[in-house]
Interface confidence: low
């Protein structure tokens, strides 16, 4: 318990400021699994990595939150980071 959250935080903290901005923009439009809601734009854009991690886990729980984060990172071209996140959550 908590491993996925730590892995999400580690990934987000390793993004540059510009990349974190890109991540948030992508999160606003990424397809979601049925039954899950979208984090409100207003709240999302002002969050730092720590707040965003907490929000991702509260909205999507740890497992899906990590999967969603990895998907967005992959769409940003950050395959390596996405892979590291997924590896960390499946240990």
């Amino acid at each position: 318990m908590g491993r996925a959250r730590d892995a999400i935080l580690d990934a987000l903290e390793n993004l540059t400021a510009e990349e974190l901005k890109k991540f948030k923009l992508k999160l606003l439009s990424v397809p979601l699994r049925e039954g899950y809601g979208r984090i409100p734009r207003g709240a999302l854009l002002s969050m730092d990595a720590l707040d965003l991690t907490d929000k991702l886990v509260s909205f999507y729980l740890e497992t899906y939150g990590a999967e969603l984060t990895a998907n967005v990172l992959r769409d940003m071209g950050l395959q390596e980071m996405a892979g590291q996140l997924q590896a960390a959550t499946h240990q």
Epitope: N14, K22, E80
Partner: antibody, heavy 114, light 106 residues
Framework: QVQLQQSEAELARPGASVKLSCKAS????????IFWVKQRTGQGLEWIGE????????YYNENFRDKATLTADKSSSTAYMELRSLTSEDSAVYFC???????WGQGTTLTVSS | QIVLTQSPAIMSASPGEKVTITCSVS?????MYWFQQKPGTSPKVWIY???NLASGVPARFSGRGSGTSYSLTISRMEAEDAATYYC?????????FGSGTKLEIK
């Protein structure tokens, strides 16, 4: 400031190998991947592959898997691309760039000629 | 690998004219990147994540699209916009480029 300084122009013989370099400065080398792109004269861009200096992991375009080998030396903050079994088709400008936010080197011109 | 087809391959536009370059993708991707390149220089990222302008890019540029169809638009062509533009996908390896659109000023 971030800089990627690429090696000088190279002239090589058909069948030979050549190793191009890309020296990074102004940032932590291991925090970003480096990718390489080929551009023949008057032609478009071809993505060759990328390397992550922290782990040494590499990802290749299958079209270049038998042609290029990517390596990185953390101690000198330098990425390398070795091209082997050179032919005239390998004559091109080769660019290196920082993977995440697209800082590009100035390019290295490789000419393969007998 | 994912194939990106740009059109037109070459075009001319008068100052003030609206210009649209399209990038058709063989398999659906989530986002598109656009690069500008002028002769003898390295490519510059121009638009990232489909619609976000890179730092220093004039507001007359815009990007849009989804799935298998993306575009770059210049609302009013200026002489400094003459260049070759490339689209690129980063959704799956290898990160392929389009063949380029050479934009000339009339």
């Amino acid at each position: 400031q971030v800089q990627l300084q690429q090696s000088e122009a190279e002239l090589a013989r058909p069948g030979a190998s050549v190793k191009l370099s890309c020296k990074a400065s102004g940032y932590t080398f291991t925090s970003y991947g480096i990718f390489w792109v080929k551009q023949r004269t008057g032609q478009g861009l071809e993505w060759i592959g990328e390397i992550y200096p922290r782990s040494g992991n590499t990802y290749y375009n299958e079209n270049f898997r038998d042609k290029a080998t990517l390596t990185a030396d953390k101690s000198s903050s330098t990425a390398y691309m070795e091209l082997r079994s050179l032919t005239s088709e390998d004559s091109a400008v080769y660019f290196c760039a920082r993977q995440r936010d697209d800082y590009w080197g100035q390019g290295t011109t490789l000419t393969v000629s007998s | 690998q994912i194939v990106l087809t740009q059109s037109p391959a070459i075009m001319s536009a008068s100052p003030g004219e609206k210009v649209t370059i399209t990038c058709s993708v063989s398999s659906s991707v989530s986002y598109m990147y656009w690069f500008q390149q002028k002769p003898g220089t390295s490519p510059k990222v121009w638009i990232y994540s489909t619609s976000n302008l890179a730092s220093g890019v004039p507001a007359r540029f815009s990007g849009r699209g989804s799935g298998t169809s993306y575009s770059l638009t210049i609302s009013r062509m200026e002489a400094e916009d003459a260049a070759t533009y490339y689209c690129q996908q980063r959704s799956s390896y290898p990160f392929t480029f389009g063949s380029g659109t050479k934009l000339e000023i009339k």
